[in-house]
């Protein structure tokens, strides 16, 4: 199941996943001036078995000549629940996290990838929080949030973290202090009702969708 909401927001903090549970989807987004190839994948999908997980489908971007602007994707008034993206992060992961069974590590960048990544998390995903640069962490408990299924609905647990305005930054588990570049903004994306078996994306698409037929019926 995909998580219905974004992980909680903590003032002056960002979060990220150290590894991605099987079923996690990553949008194939391209930077300005480029677009997904028409026969290419819409998403990458973390798949695998208990011993090995990897990202299915490759994202491919192609030049779009005169195109130099991005689309205006504006939510309607009733969709005010803000969805967040994450800036592209280094594929380097702490070994103990990325090697978790049933999890994928951060996918490597693809050529002409967008500067932000849009993930669709699944139930059981854990994200870790840290205070942004210039703020210090006051921990009351774990600085993490997990997407859980309760009574048929998904929810994220509340991370026990307060960030106060001091110059020392706290770190994600297993990470060195950041060098020059700041951490990414909060990530993620969502919605509902998915099983990974539904998601046999583009490998067969070129062959099968060419003959795809839509039929409509009046009920």
């Amino acid at each position: 199941e995909l998580c219905d909401d974004d992980p909680p927001e903590i003032p002056h903090a960002t979060f990220k996943a150290m590894a991605y549970k099987e079923g996690t989807m990553l949008n194939c987004e391209c930077k300005r001036g480029f677009r997904r190839i028409k026969s290419g994948s819409l998403y990458m999908l973390c798949t695998g078995n208990s011993s090995h997980s990897s990202w299915d489908n490759q994202c491919q971007c192609t030049s779009s000549a005169t195109r130099n602007t991005t689309k205006q994707v504006t939510p309607q008034p009733e969709e005010q629940k803000e969805r967040k993206t994450t800036e592209m992060q280094s594929p380097m992961q702490p070994v103990d996290q990325a090697s978790l069974p049933g999890h994928c590590r951060e996918p490597p960048p693809w050529e002409n990838e967008a500067t932000e990544r849009i993930y669709h998390f699944v139930v059981g995903q854990m994200v870790y929080y840290q205070c942004v640069q210039g703020y210090r962490a006051l921990h009351r408990g774990p600085a993490e949030s997990v997407c859980k299924m309760t009574h048929g609905k998904t929810r994220w647990t509340q991370p026990q973290l307060i960030c106060t305005g001091e110059m020392e930054t706290s770190q994600f588990p297993g990470e060195e202090k950041p060098q020059a570049s700041p951490e990414g903004r909060p990530e993620s994306e969502t919605s509902c009702l998915v099983t990974t078996t539904d998601f046999q994306i583009q490998t067969e698409m070129a062959a099968t969708m060419e003959t795809s037929i839509f039929t409509t019926e009046y009920q």
Epitope: Y43, R67, D198, F199, M209
Partner: antibody, heavy 113, light 107 residues
């Protein structure tokens, strides 16, 4: 007039769940009008402002079928209703706008008193 | 919503003619534009996407050009099968919108 209609759209020959399915209507002798769409794998539907509150788009992944229900029907809702595949991904809860590369044959809905 | 205006509304031409249809957007849509062909009683068929990319299986006599607010669909040598109505569609903004259509009829 005043009643509802539910039109179905069954996809065959390819992957259904991960692609956006949009509904586009065409009144007799008129142009094309986008009503809204859904990506079945996410279950989240987006609607054109004009139809907000009157249209409900759903999808059943198990049968590769999308549905469009239009309520409070008026005579000017008489039209051919098409479903079409579009290549938008889900971005911040909204289906990224795209073009339509596969179309259903259309269903004529006539609203008369 | 972004308004799309096509011209002309009707175009009379003969087989072999070079035909040009124009589509104007009420604001810049970069190259996020598609062209469709529709015949009576049939669903629209995608011809061109991203303003100038030819859809697979569409004859090369169809071509698209333009960016920003002004776009053109050109049929280099009109064939009997090309008499139909043509629509442009923008997908720059959330609410995709179509032009009112251009009917290409036999002169």
């Amino acid at each position: 007039p005043g009643s509802s209609v539910k039109v179905s759209c069954k996809a065959s020959g390819g992957t259904f769940s991960s692609y956006a399915i949009s509904w586009v209507r065409q009144a007799p002798g008129q142009g094309l009008e986008w009503m809204g769409g859904i990506i079945p794998i996410f279950g989240t539907a987006n609607y054109a402002q004009k139809f907000q509150g009157r249209v409900t788009i759903t999808a059943d992944k198990s049968t590769s079928t999308a549905y469009m229900e239009l309520s409070s029907l008026r005579s000017d809702d008489t039209a051919v209703y098409y479903c079409a595949r579009d290549l938008g991904t889900m971005v911040r809860g909204v289906i990224e706008p795209y073009y339509f590369d596969y179309w259903g044959q259309g269903t004529l809905v006539t609203v008369s008193s | 919503d972004i308004q799309m205006t096509q011209s002309p509304s009707t175009l009379s031409a003969s087989v072999g003619d070079r035909v040009t249809i124009t589509c104007r957007a009420s604001q810049s849509i970069s190259s996020w534009l598609a062209w469709y062909q529709q015949k009576p009683g049939k669903a629209p068929k995608l011809l061109i996407y991203d303003a100038f990319s030819l859809e697979s299986g569409v004859p090369s006599r169809f071509s698209g050009s333009g960016s920003g607010t002004e776009f053109t669909l050109t049929i280099s040598s009109l064939q009997p099968d090309d008499f139909a109505t043509y629509y442009c569609q923008q997908y720059n903004s959330y609410s995709r919108t179509f032009g009112q259509g251009t009917k290409v009829e036999i002169k």
